[in-house]
Interface confidence: medium
């Protein structure tokens, strides 16, 4: 008789999840010499220990603490790039601008990027069939709690001028319900962070509107100002040219507005 299994609304654990995490860890520690001391088997054991045998709607930040410890890493606090709903461009940018970091450029973010995982209460099995959906099932699921934990701590680590890349093609350029809007904004530390600078990325070739005047950007400015952090905003009208000029800043066409 097949054992009854909880059916969740979200997709199941990513195929070959243990192998993927382990392989990513090994790759990351090879590329980043300052992390070569990391024992990837211990990292996997800590990752697994955060959610295996636990009810996937009852995960806490504390469950991830052993993993957090193993992922301890120096991040230049004045070189942090946050993003919301525009991950690919943010990552392309930090691949070119090597001294800036998104969360996914850190070991912990790199390990989990684009992956899904969950277990089952009281069994050592990984659930490859389905995992809880944040909206339809529960918010305290393994993936959501992981990202909330690392995002909060990443924002807490930021200092001086913090940059955030926002998607100007979306109806809500700043979304209070995104990880940036609900976690990172509220965990920037006013004692350390002087300015939050938003880069609003335009989608359309002919779009010359000033999206920094968008009501949701004004809402972000209000939230940030109330936290005693200065706010500034820039339109990035041509993201392709923007990236090109980051690669080749001496190019004569890069003196004009991007």
């Amino acid at each position: 008789v097949p054992r009854w299994r909880q059916q969740w609304s979200g997709p199941g654990t990513t195929k070959r999840f243990p192998e993927t995490v382990l392989a990513r860890c090994v790759k990351y520690t090879e590329i980043h010499p300052e992390m070569r001391h990391v024992d990837c088997q211990s990292v996997w054991d800590a990752f697994k220990g955060a959610f295996i045998s636990k009810h996937p709607c009852n995960i806490t930040e504390e469950d991830y603490q052993p993993l957090m410890k193993l992922g301890t890493q120096t991040v230049p606090c004045n070189k942090i790039l946050l993003w919301s709903r525009i991950k690919d461009l943010a990552h392309q940018f930090t691949q070119v601008q090597r001294d800036m970091f998104t969360l996914e450029d850190t070991l912990l973010g790199y390990l989990a990027d684009d992956l899904t995982w969950c277990g089952e209460f009281n069994t050592s099995k990984i659930n490859y069939q389905s995992c809880p959906d944040w909206r339809k099932d529960c918010s305290n699921n393994p993936v959501s709690v992981f990202w909330k934990t690392v995002s909060r701590r990443f924002a807490e680590a930021a200092c001086d001028v913090v940059h955030v890349m926002l998607n100007g093609s979306r109806s809500k350029i700043f979304d209070k319900n995104s990880t940036f809007g609900s976690v990172e904004v509220h965990n920037l530390q006013p004692e350390k962070v002087q300015t939050l600078e938003a880069w609003v990325i335009h989608g359309g070739r002919e779009d010359s509107r000033d999206l920094c005047q968008d009501p949701t950007i004004k809402e972000l400015e209000s939230i940030i100002s109330k936290r005693n952090i200065q706010f500034s905003c820039k339109n990035i009208y041509r993201p392709d040219k923007f990236l090109q000029c980051v690669k080749n800043p001496e190019d004569s066409s890069c003196t004009s507005e991007i």
Partner: nanobody, 119 residues
């Protein structure tokens, strides 16, 4: 502006002890986790220990566990690292660093203090 100033380094024989201090200013010291990290000549920076804002959560790197003790005095805005049973491989510049809670991300903000273990 966030500032940390490390002191207490020096030359010590193997098996000896030292106490490092880190004076912090420009932020509410009692609200932040603090780290010690070190960098040996020609090597990458290595994390040593972390203490949470209230002193209740402490972690050490395996290489120093049982020999080093991290502590803090929030009334003096000062972080400490007691180094016992020192070995030659502990020779490094020691930095105190402002953390986020109890990690995992931190930033080196000080000039460091040099610890040399040699006979």
């Amino acid at each position: 502006e966030v500032q940390v100033l490390e002191s207490g380094g020096g030359l010590v024989q193997p098996g000896g002890s030292l106490r490092l201090s880190c004076a912090a200013s420009g932020f509410t010291f009692s609200s932040y986790g603090m780290h010690w990290v070190r960098q040996a000549p020609g090597k990458e920076r290595e994390w040593v220990a972390v203490i949470s804002y209230d002193g209740n959560t402490i972690y050490y790197a395996d290489s120093v566990k049982g020999r080093f003790t991290i502590s803090r005095d929030n009334s003096k805005n000062t972080l400490y690292l007691q180094l016992n049973s020192l070995k030659s491989e502990d020779t490094a510049v020691y930095y105190c660093a402002l953390g986020a809670g109890s990690g995992p991300f931190f930033d080196n903000r000080g000039q460091g203090t040099l610890v040399t273990v040699s006979s």
